[in-house]
Every structure is written in structure tokens, then in C-alpha cells.
């Protein structure tokens, strides 16, 4: 008799999820000698232990603590790049500027990037059919809780000048409900972080507006200022040229505004 299985609104666990996590862990630790001590089998066991046999709407940050402990990593706290709704450009930037780190350039972020996972209450099975959707089902699902946990820790680790890349093409350039707006902004430590510098990335070729004057950016500035952190903002009018100038800063065309 086939067992009744909960149908969730979101996509199921990414196929070959265990193999993908393990392979990514091995690859990451090969590339980063400072993480060579990490036992990837133990990392997978801790990852699995966070959600297997648990109701996928009842996951807590506590469930991920063994994984957090194993994945503890020291990144230069003054080289952190946060992003919101513009992941690809942020990653293209750190591909070139390798002394800077997005969350996905850390071991735990790298392991989980673009993956989905969940289990089922009281069975050791991974659910490859469906997983809870944050809006339609529940917010305390394995994926959302994971990203909330690692994002909080990443923001807490930041110091000096923290950069954030924001998508100037969105109706809400700064969105209070994004991970950046709801988690990272509130976990920057005022005693360590001097300035949050926003880079607003323009979408249109002919868009010469000063998006740093956008009401949502002013809202971000207000939140940050109330937390005793300075705020600055830059328009990146041409992201293609911006990346090119990161690659070749000596280029004569890179002295003008980008």
C-alpha cells in the first residue's frame, strides 16, 4: 500500500542532492587550503541531520547548529559583499575580486547555492517530489531556515566597510522583506561595522537617474543610521563597464563615472 505523502507547493529536493553537497564540499576544501581540515562526510551527516525525519515546517536554527559548527570559517571581515536580487553580478564581481566574499563564496553558502531540500516527519527519506514554499506553505522550512541562519552569521561577522549590491531595476530597490532587508541589515554589528556602502546597479543603458535618491534607499539609510552605522551609496550606471574596470582598473576609460 503506497504511503500517503504530503504535497507541498514548492519544488522538491534537487536531484542527486546528497552527492551534490558532498562533491561541492570536496571541491571547496581542495581549493581553499585553510578548509582542508574539514571532513566532508561529517559535513554531509550534519547537513542531513538538520532536516531528515523532521517536519519540514518545523525546522529551527538550532537544527543547523552542528552544521554551522563544522562549517565555521574565517573570512576577512572587511571584505564582505552582500547582495539583494542581483546574485549573478555579485558573483561575477567576486570571481574577479577574489579577496572579497559573498555568502556563496564561503563553504556553507557554496554547498547550498541554488539547491532545494526537505525531508518528511518520522521517515529517513528525502522528499524529491515537493518541498514547502515560503509563502504558500510555511516559513520555517529547511531551505529558508538554512539561509536565514547562515545569512545572520555572515552579517554578524562583517566589519569596517560592508558593501551591498542592489538591483536598481526592481520596483523596491531595497526590500525590507528580502534576506538582506530582514536578516542581514539587522545583524550588522555597530561596534564593528563603520559603514554600509550600497552599490545600486542600473539596468537600462540610458538610465542616468540618481537611484541613490530612491525612497527605498532613503529607508535603508534611515534603518542603518538608527543602528549607528554610516551609510553611503553609489550608482553603477553601467554594470558591464563596472566589471570590465574591476578586471582592468588601469584602463583609461575607468577613471570616469561608471
Amino acid at each position: 500500500v503506497p504511503r500517503w505523502r504530503q504535497q507541498w507547493s514548492g519544488p522538491g529536493t534537487t536531484k542527486r542532492f546528497p552527492e551534490t553537497v558532498l562533491a561541492r564540499c570536496v571541491k571547496y576544501t581542495e581549493i581553499h587550503p585553510e578548509m582542508r581540515h574539514v571532513d566532508c562526510q561529517s559535513v554531509w551527516d550534519a547537513f542531513k541531520g538538520a532536516f531528515i525525519s523532521k517536519h519540514p515546517c518545523n525546522i529551527t536554527e538550532e537544527d543547523y547548529q552542528p552544521l554551522m559548527k563544522l562549517g565555521t570559517q574565517t573570512v576577512p571581515c572587511n571584505k564582505i559583499l552582500l547582495w539583494s536580487r542581483i546574485k549573478d553580478l555579485a558573483h561575477q564581481f567576486t570571481q574577479v575580486q577574489r579577496d572579497m566574499f559573498t555568502l556563496e563564496d564561503t563553504l556553507l553558502g557554496y554547498l547550498a547555492d541554488d539547491l532545494t531540500w526537505c525531508g518528511e516527519f518520522n521517515t529517513s527519506k528525502i522528499n524529491y517530489q515537493s518541498c514547502p514554499d515560503w509563502r504558500k506553505d510555511c516559513s520555517n522550512n529547511p531551505v529558508s531556515v538554512f539561509w536565514k541562519t547562515v545569512s545572520r552569521r555572515f552579517a554578524e561577522a562583517a566589519c569596517d566597510v560592508v558593501h551591498v549590491m542592489l538591483n536598481g531595476s526592481r520596483s523596491k530597490i531595497f526590500d525590507k522583506n528580502s534576506t538582506f532587508g530582514s536578516v542581514e541589515v539587522h545583524n550588522l554589528q555597530p561596534e564593528k561595522v563603520q559603514t554600509l556602502e550600497a552599490w545600486v546597479i542600473h539596468g537600462g543603458r540610458e538610465d542616468s537617474r540618481d537611484l541613490c535618491q530612491d525612497p527605498t534607499i532613503k529607508e535603508l539609510e534611515s534603518i542603518i543610521s538608527k543602528r549607528n552605522i554610516q551609510f553611503s551609496c553609489k550608482n553603477i550606471y553601467r554594470p558591464d563597464k563596472f566589471l570590465q574596470c574591476v578586471k582592468n582598473p588601469e584602463d583609461s576609460s575607468c577613471t570616469s563615472e561608471i
Epitope: Y28, V96, R98, P249
Partner: nanobody
Framework: DVQLQESGGGLVQAGDSLRLSCAAS????????IGWFRQAPGKEREFVAG????????LYSDSVKGRFTISRDNDKNTAYLQMNSLKPEDTALYYC?????????????????????WGKGTLVTVSS
């Protein structure tokens, strides 16, 4: 573009040590895998040792394994080749070369034809 400048060569006795440096100018030294090559008089240029952008992978030719150590300091834009127990057959012009490497691609093959930038070389002479 990346410019590479080797230094540290010289005349030594067999059994001695030398440390070669490869100083890079230009941006993003840490985007490149670095290889050391050498060319002995009348011979083809050959691969000696290589290091990935993050120092995660090291490669050595069989002839230098256990005697030479490659390293790099990305903050100083410099790669090094520590050469111990030198032999007369290590006499050659030593070149460093750079090859772009993806951030999350750990494998690399430092073939001579795949190298994008070369230094002018530093001469190492080992007398018996």
C-alpha cells in the same frame, strides 16, 4: 595585463639552495595559476612546478619532486620556487608564467602553450 619579473638566480654549488621569486605587476594576481618552467642550454623548455590561484593545488615534475617547493603570497603579488639539494642538471634559465584560473575550478594543467603571460627568466647555474 600581468607583467612577471623573475629574480633570485645565481651561481651555486651542487647541494646548495636557492629561492626564486616571481613578482607580478598588474591587477588580480590571485586570478592566475603560476607555473615555473626552465630551459637548459640546447634543450626544450620544460615544466618544473605549478600552483593554483589559492595554493590549493600544487604540481611538480618528477625531476624536482621532493627537492623544490612552490608557494605564493597573493598579498605580495609574488610566487616563489624554493630549490634545495641543487644538482648540475638543474642548470637552466628559469621562467615563471601565469594562466587565468576560475575561482571554483581547482584542476589546472600548466602546459607551456596554455600560459598567457611569461617573465624574461632568471639564470640558475649549479657547478659540481
Amino acid at each position: 595585463d600581468v607583467q612577471l619579473q623573475e629574480s633570485g638566480g645565481g651561481l651555486v654549488q651542487a647541494g646548495d639552495s636557492l629561492r626564486l621569486s616571481c613578482a607580478a605587476s598588474g591587477p588580480h594576481f590571485n586570478n592566475y595559476a603560476i607555473g615555473w618552467f626552465r630551459q637548459a642550454p640546447g634543450k626544450e623548455r620544460e615544466f618544473v612546478a605549478g600552483i593554483s590561484w589559492s595554493s590549493g593545488s600544487l604540481l611538480y615534475s618528477d625531476s624536482v619532486k621532493g627537492r623544490f617547493t612552490i608557494s605564493r603570497d597573493n598579498d605580495k603579488n609574488t610566487a616563489y620556487l624554493q630549490m634545495n639539494s641543487l644538482k648540475p642538471e638543474d642548470t637552466a634559465l628559469y621562467y615563471c608564467a601565469a594562466q587565468y584560473q576560475e575561482r571554483y575550478y581547482s584542476d589546472f594543467s600548466l602546459k607551456e602553450k596554455g600560459m598567457e603571460y611569461w617573465g624574461k627568466g632568471t639564470l640558475v647555474t649549479v657547478s659540481s
